[in-house]
Amino acid sequence: LQDPCSNCPAGTFCDNNRNQICSPCPPNSFSSAGGQRTCDICRQCKGVFRTRKECSSTSNAECDCTPGFHCLGAGCSMCEQDCKQGQELTKKGCKDCCFGTFNDQKRGICRPWTNCSLDGKSVLVNGTKERDVVCGPSPADLSPGASSVTPPAPAREPGHSPQ
């Protein structure tokens, strides 16, 4: 015998209290598949979360984060504070990237500048807290007649622009 509940479409539940007829999921609940015996409670986008999309009878609410925060985890399960470019989030809050590292986003950690010499290249543009080093041609390419590019003079403290 076929289960009568299998005829209940998404957005409904098989109501045992009403001879297993298909009843609509009540407000603030949903069922994303057919044949369900209960509806799931909708997610509430509260506090630092905000509603991206309301809960419908067939799909859960979608949340993201209020301005100044960004999503982490599957389905935006957490909101993490934004920092400025050139910073990273620590337990004590947003901290500037250490010398020799950079972060060009409002999230994530500071990453080391590219080591141009590992690729046999020279530094064309110094790195900053917000931007990676730009590597230029290899020193061999800078032999007379090969290029008119002049390698930059080494800065006293490479990486940071003078104030």
């Epitope: 957005g11 609509p24 999921c25 407000p27 905000r50 509603t51 419908s56």
Partner: antibody, heavy 114, light 112 residues
Framework: SVEESGGRLVTPGTPLTLTCTVS????????MIWVRQAPGEGLQYIGF?????YTYYTNWAKGRFTISRTSTTVDLKMTSLTAADTATYFC????????????WGPGTLVTVSS | DVVMTQTPASVSEPVRATVTIKCQAS??????LAWYQQKPGQPPKLLIY???TLASGVPSRFSGSGSGTEFTLTISDLECADAATYYC??????????????FGGGTEVVFK
């Protein structure tokens, strides 16, 4: 309560902004919806701004209609108006965290004619 | 698009009768359907949402049922004040933040 304003007679192509002013509740906690009704015709859903400040529009309204909000008002900006846009425009508050229009204003009439 | 087909376009019944209005969606919308009542010169009034949930202050003579593509509004023990046009409306999200929150064409309820 909800009340619309800004409806008037305009010539085709003229942009127009309607304003919905609310009292007794906080706009930022609700879906705020715009619906229109041409004279003697049925209802047409335009779109809404939700409690997360996201806007959604029906296919025919996307690009020509823009919904925005302040703390006490919701605006509907309309461009490239034609005679077919002649209608009463209703603003409504969504019921129970949804985009079903629950609390409606009386409407404001927009007439587009040369 | 999601097309909502409402039947009949008009119904005439005596006081205390029962009226049934049907709404058919062109594709499954789960239980995301509402019913509204509109009287001439007035804004619509929400009667039922989520297919069967009665809105605040609406008498229990109004009831909604259905799911998927077939929905019904039933008005029992018809009163003079029920003379109005009734609309169904779905909630349906498409891609690219486009919505298909379509209204049906309406059903006019008049008295014999």
């Amino acid at each position: 309560s909800v009340e619309e304003s800004g409806g008037r007679l305009v010539t085709p192509g003229t942009p127009l902004t309607l304003t919905c002013t609310v009292s007794g509740f906080t706009i930022s906690s609700h879906h705020m919806i715009w619906v229109r009704q041409a004279p003697g015709e049925g209802l047409q859903y335009i779109g809404f701004i939700n409690d997360g400040d996201y806007t959604y529009y029906t296919n025919w309204a996307k690009g020509r209609f823009t919904i925005s909000r302040t703390s006490t008002t919701v605006d509907l900006k309309m461009t490239s108006l034609t005679a077919a846009d002649t209608a009463t425009y209703f603003c409504a508050r969504g019921v129970d965290g949804t985009s079903y229009p629950g609390l409606w204003g009386p409407g404001t009439l927009v007439t587009v004619s040369s | 698009d999601v097309v909502m087909t409402q039947t009949p376009a008009s119904v005439s019944e005596p006081v205390r009768a029962t009226v049934t209005i049907k709404c058919q969606a062109s594709q499954s919308i789960g239980a995301d359907l509402a019913w509204y009542q509109q009287k001439p010169g007035q804004p619509p009034k929400l009667l039922i949402y989520r297919a069967s949930t009665l809105a605040s202050g609406v008498p229990s003579r109004f009831s909604g049922s259905g799911s998927g593509t077939e929905f019904t509004l039933t008005i029992s023990d018809l009163e003079c004040a029920d003379a109005a046009t009734y609309y169904c409306q779905c909630i349906y999200y498409g891609t690219d933040d486009v919505i298909y929150h379509t209204f049906g064409g309406g059903t006019e309820v008049v008295f014999k």
